[in-house]
Interface confidence: medium
């Protein structure tokens, strides 16, 4: 059964936590994805970023939870109109940006 | 307003025992990690230890493992520091402070006690 | 377990602009938070989580963290800002809270 929507933020929260938390080299190999815009639409564009990284199993458990967020299918090579223009960064400044973000609205307690 | 008062600081001879106590009000304590926090005399500040909001997890730092207990009472809105076999490099001013909570790692503490002096001396 | 390192002392005349440093091995990739401290009281946030701010804490604090090095900067300095100023991270490796060193702001 699906759960509340305050519990699955606060378990991707968690998941970030732990990615940045245990990081002892460059996540992902220093692979670099496109920046996103943080404000409306966050998970989908998080997703439509991240999932063009492949073969990093330290985020592909945060590619399922913010798979389960966004409401249509995402897919490889998909852009967002919430990417910023040309601007890539690496996944770990992405991921810690994301955790930062997501907690802000966890606070606020906005969970969709 | 939230707020926190330490107290049981004194001077105690090395080898002895003391227990501290911090007292929280104006926020719901039993959702929050509690810290403790030291600071001797013109130096730094020094991290002891935390006790996750439900008390279902302690963390101490080397220097007081084995030696220091940290327990919560969540009804009657108290942290407590339980020091054994003082030592004098112990001598130092202890702060409780709060700090939001997730499942892996605390937060910044936001709200912090006035402190309470305690001087390890023969 | 980890090390945060700080200069023990910055110096800035009132109405400039102060940077705090502090070092740690990929301290990019974790959350820093900043104190300031002045005598004989307790320790009040002025950064977390980086870059944010406690209501209360004025605009003219700020903070970012990349690569190896974490800053807190205070800009148009006035000499209510002397104090100790410190960082702190949670490491995972030792189940911990990490302070820095601590840095003495003086205003000239």
């Known amino acids: 059964s699906p759960v509340p929507p305050s519990t699955a933020l606060k378990e991707l929260i968690e998941e970030l936590v732990n990615i940045t938390q245990n990081q002892k080299a460059p996540l992902c190999n220093g692979s670099m994805v496109w920046s996103i815009n943080l404000t409306a639409g966050v998970y989908c564009a998080a997703l439509e970023s991240l999932i063009n990284v492949s073969g990093c199993s330290a985020i592909e458990k945060t590619q399922r939870m913010l798979n389960g967020f966004c409401p249509h299918k995402v897919s490889a090579g998909q852009f967002s109109s919430l990417r910023v223009r040309d601007t890539k960064i690496e996944v770990a400044q992405f991921v810690k940006d994301l955790l930062v973000h997501l907690k802000k609205l966890f606070r606020e307690g906005q969970f969709n | 307003q939230m707020q926190l008062v330490e107290s049981g600081g004194g001077v105690v001879q090395p080898g002895r025992s003391l227990r501290l106590s911090c007292a929280a009000s104006?926020?719901?304590?039993?959702?929050?990690?509690m810290h403790w926090v030291r600071q001797a005399p013109g130096k730094g500040l020094e991290w002891v230890a935390v006790?996750?909001?439900?008390?279902?997890?302690?963390h101490y730092a080397d220097s007081v493992k084995g030696r220091f207990t940290i327990t919560r009472d969540n009804s009657k809105n108290t942290l407590n520091l339980q020091m054994n076999s003082l030592r004098a490099e112990d001598t130092a001013v202890y702060y409780c402070?709060?700090?939001?909570?997730?499942?892996?790692?605390?937060?910044?503490?936001?709200?912090w006690g006035q402190g309470t002096m305690v001087t390890v001396s023969s | 377990s980890y090390v945060l390192t700080q200069p023990p002392s910055v110096s800035v005349a009132p109405g400039q602009t102060a940077r705090i440093t502090c070092g740690g091995n990929?301290?990019?990739?974790?959350?820093v938070h900043w104190y300031q401290q002045k005598p004989g009281q307790a320790p009040v946030l002025v950064v977390y989580?980086?870059?944010d701010r406690p209501s209360l804490i004025p605009e003219r604090f700020s903070g970012s963290n990349s690569g190896n090095t974490a800053t807190l900067t205070i800009s148009r300095v006035e000499a209510g800002d002397e104090a100790d100023y410190y960082c702190?991270?949670?490491?995972?490796?030792?189940?911990?809270?990490?302070f820095g060193g601590g840095t003495k702001l003086t205003v000239l």
């Open positions: 989580d980086d870059s």
């Open positions: 402070a709060r700090a939001p909570q997730w499942e892996l790692t605390a937060e910044a503490f936001d709200i």
């Open positions: 006790i996750w909001y439900d008390g279902s997890n302690k």
């Open positions: 990929l301290i990019g990739s974790k959350l």
């Open positions: 702190q991270v949670w490491d995972s490796s030792s189940d911990g809270v990490v």
């Open positions: 104006g926020f719901t304590f039993r959702t929050y990690g």
